[in-house]
Structures are given as C-alpha cells and as structure tokens.
C-alpha cells in the first residue's frame, strides 16, 4: 500500500523519500527489507538514512531492492516501502524507457521543463541540460532554478531532455542525472466546447474483483494547440490526487493525439486490485477548456468470472 518506485544510475547519487507520510523531525528508521538489517545513520556510510530520506552516495547496482521506512511515535508507527532499482550506465546515448520520468508538453507560450526529483537534493545552480545527449547551447535555452526554459519553441524541440546537477553532501560532490521527454504542441487552430468521445455518459463498466482495470477519458477540444484544455478523472467529486487511494492512479502526463486534425486528450485511470468498495464510487471523466466543462459519469459493476466446468 505505502510503496513507491525509485530508480537511479550506478555511481550517481540517489535520494529516496519515505513514501509513508510523517512530519519533519519525527524519527524515521530505515531497513533493508530482505534482511531486516537496519540502515545506518552515520554519514560516513555510502548508504545511510537521514530522517525521511534514504541516501545512496553513490548508488551501486547491488543496492537494488525494497527498503522499509518506519516513522516512529510512541502510539502510532507508520510503515512505508521504497522499491529501489539501480541500473548500469548505458554506453550509448539512448535513455531506456525505465529510466524516463513523466513526459511534459510545451508550446510557444509555455516551455518549462522541470528537472525531476531535484527537490530532494542539495544542489546549486546552474543545472546542465542535454537534449538527446547533446549539451544545449545558444540563447534560446535558459536554465532557470530547477527548470529549463526554451524560447520560441518549435516542433524540432521535441525529444528527450536530461538535466545534470551536482549533489553536495558534507563537502563531497556527486553527480545526478534525470531524463524526461518533451513534446511540442502546435500553436495554430481553434477551440470548441469539449466533446467527450469516451466513456459514454452513464456508462457501466464491468470489472473483475481482484483484477486491474483501466478507464480512459478521451475528449477533443478543437484544432491545433489548445491554450487551456484538460481531461481528468474525479472520484466522488474529488480529484484523484486528493482522494488519496494509492491503488487508483491517473496516468501521469496526458496523451495528446490529433484525430482528423482535432486536438484530443486522453487520461487513463488505472485501478489496481479492484475491490468491492470501488463499485460504490462514482467515476467522473471531466473535459474542460475555455468554453466550459463537460462531464461523463461511469460506474463499475462486477463481472462474474466465467465458470469452467468439466
């Protein structure tokens, strides 16, 4: 339940936050789950715990595994799990999918690319930025705080962007890199009142208890880049992120497609390990832009597994 995936490259720094919510200043104990061995807090160790953070300075492939964190209190301990994978550095330029953070979209009006996970590190500006492994040069590129700004964005600016920075720990420096894809939205076109293609209004979706289920909210908003357009899921009228059920997640980053020249977005709602109580929830697919908001409601019903009799 309280689990989070983290990944990094060997010989780079990796810092992981305990997925279980505590508050600053509380004691957090870390363990290597496979052996139940306590992670030391002394900073002279290559891997050490520092409050809510677990630090690999630097990381090694052998560090991969599940780490347990326990936020301690005399009356209520809270346990979380960090699933850490450390990969070998690639010799070629390609960044494999498993090392990629969520894709971001930009346009001429908004071309910020944030450096993922940087807030966990003790770093100083400026960041170094690379596109498809080439260092970015020229006045169009500006590294500002923890993000990259691209002036006069063009379609050719789409690609994989890597930020590189130095984490400092007690005077020692460690390199960190993080990569995410950037897509460019076309600026010309027009906008319409949102049209939801899926799901149908008041659709009943059959799901199997204990299995995973996906719901796709898909809507079109006009032609070309939309100044303001979004699709999202709500549960019982609450945003997914606020609802706080870890089994139910929206797919990070909205997929943009152009169907018959129309600008369309879809957002996939992933429900892991469907439970009885999920059938009682109201799932709303919301599509909104400057013209207004359209809502289609979906409910789940139990699909009875087909009996197999001899």
């Amino acid at each position: 339940k309280f689990s989070k995936q983290s990944w990094g490259l060997e010989n780079e720094a990796l810092i992981v936050r305990c997925p279980r919510q505590g508050k600053p200043s509380y004691t957090v104990d870390w363990y290597y789950s496979q052996t139940n061995k306590s992670i030391p807090t002394q900073e002279r160790n290559r891997v050490f715990a520092s409050g809510q953070l677990l630090k690999f300075l630097p990381a090694a492939v052998a560090d991969s595994g599940i780490y347990t964190c326990i936020v301690r209190s005399p009356t209520f301990n809270r346990t979380g799990y960090a699933n850490v994978t450390i990969y070998k550095k690639q010799s070629d330029c390609n960044v494999p999918d498993y090392l990629m953070y969520s894709t971001v979209s930009g346009s001429e009006k908004n071309s910020k690319i944030y450096c993922p996970t940087i807030d966990l590190y003790n770093w100083t500006a400026p960041l170094e930025w690379f596109k498809n492994c080439q260092a970015l040069q020229g006045s169009r590129y500006r590294a500002h705080k923890s993000f990259l700004v691209i002036d006069n964005v063009m379609t050719e600016d789409a690609g994989d962007y890597t930020c590189k920075f130095i984490h400092n720990e007690n005077g020692a420096n460690y390199s960190v890199t993080a990569t995410r894809s950037f897509t460019v939205k076309d600026e010309q076109g027009f906008s319409l009142f949102p049209v939801i293609g899926a799901p149908a209004q008041n659709e009943i979706k059959e799901v199997e208890i204990g299995k995973n289920a996906n719901l796709t909210c898909s809507a079109c908003f006009g032609k070309g880049t939309q100044f303001l357009a979004a699709v999202l899921w709500q549960l019982n009228g609450t945003k997914i992120t606020d609802f706080g059920e870890p089994r139910i997640q929206q797919e990070e980053g909205q997929n943009q497609s152009f169907s018959n020249g129309l600008a369309c977005l879809d957002m996939v709602l992933r429900i892991a390990d469907v439970k009885e109580e999920d059938l009682l929830l109201q799932y709303d697919c919301l599509a909104l832009n400057l013209h207004g908001l359209r809502r289609h409601t979906v409910r789940l019903s139990r699909k009875n597994p087909i009996d197999h009799h001899s």
């Epitope: 004691t27 005399p74 009356t75 209520f76 706080g244």
Partner: antibody, heavy 117, light 111 residues
Amino acid sequence: DVQLQQSGPGLVKPSQSLSLTCTVTGYSITSDYAWNWIRQFPGNKLEWMGYIDYSGSTTYNPSLKSRFSITRDTSKNQFFLQLNSVTTEDTATYYCASTVIDSMDYWGQGTSVTVSS
Amino acid sequence: DIVLTQSPASLAVSLGQRATISCRASKSVSTSGHSYMHWYQQKPGQPPKLLIYLASNLESGVPARFSGSGSGTDFTLNINPMEEEDAATYYCQHSREFPFTFGSGTKLEIK
C-alpha cells in the same frame, strides 16, 4: 487540503444515543492517518475520545468505558461517533479531527450537542 | 492518565511584548530523543488550530513569532512579539501514551 465537515443532532434526550457524522473531502480515510473524535465541555476542557485509523482499527479513551464507538463508511468517506446512554454530563461541542502522526492536524467545525429532556 | 497543568489560567500582554505560557505534565512525555507535546490555539466559535508539534516544531503556515521549548515534564509556548490576532485560548496536548490528554487552557488577552 483535507477538510472535515460534521453533521448530527444538536439536542439529545438523556439515556438515548448520540450519533455524529464526519465527512472527509480532499483525502481518502482509507489511505492513511487516524480519524479522531474530541469533545469540549462548557468549561472549555478538551477530552480526546478516540480514533479510527486508515485500516479501520480503533483506539478509545478508557474513561468512556464501553459507551463509545467509532465506525466508518469507506464508500462515503465518512466516520461516525456513537455515544450510548448519554447524560447531561455529555453536553459538549464535539469535534472530529485528523492525525497525520500524534497531533490533531485538521479539525471539523464542531457540533454543539445538548443533552436535555 | 497523564495530567497536563497549564499556567497561568489567563494572561494579558501588551502588543509587541512577549507572552509566555507553561504546561507541566504529571510524568515525562519525552522518549527516544523526542518530546511528544503539542500546542494549539483556539479562538471563540472556532476549532483548535495546531501551532507546534513535538514541543518545538512549527506547524506549516504558522508565523515564526510562535515558538515552543521544553522536555520531560516542563514545556513553554512563547509568542514574541504579541499581535492583535494572537488573542485566544492556548492548549497543550501530549501523545506519549493513550489516552491523549489536553491542558486546561490559558486565555491570552491584549493588555
């Protein structure tokens, strides 16, 4: 942000049961946290009554003996107080509150309950 | 149960001056390097609001003029400088063991 909205009767007769509802928005009560009931007597004294945690496990103040229980409805994201055999001593303002860890971080608006015939 | 005794019961402080409120526990609320004492502010008609947790940690969004200190059985809440909006009743609460208990409150007024 987590928000807690309380509802329930303002007047209860002695020996009857008091039932109050706390509806949570902005967070699922099954995700994490502990969900408390606290009451404040007319002299302003505060008393922690107990909590139900994200897993449904309950912890009660022994001073309330077996008169008190907390339950929940996860489909509505609500948790409930039930106090049986009330007396005039149970006249108070009742609050629901959430605990991230130890302290009461978010509070409901409070429900004033008078026990009187 | 751990009994928390607050003093004074009421206090009047001039704007810009320091207000000091004490909370004494009937037994230690500290263990493993932490003191499990928290402070709340309550204004008339409103629920209490968390100010400080673990004796000295400022809750997010609370002004820095509020500070807490102490360990074991003796704890202090300081407000410096006192501002008009700080007129309220202040409560301490422990979470060292069940049941959690609150102090009797200190009413802070402007002199």
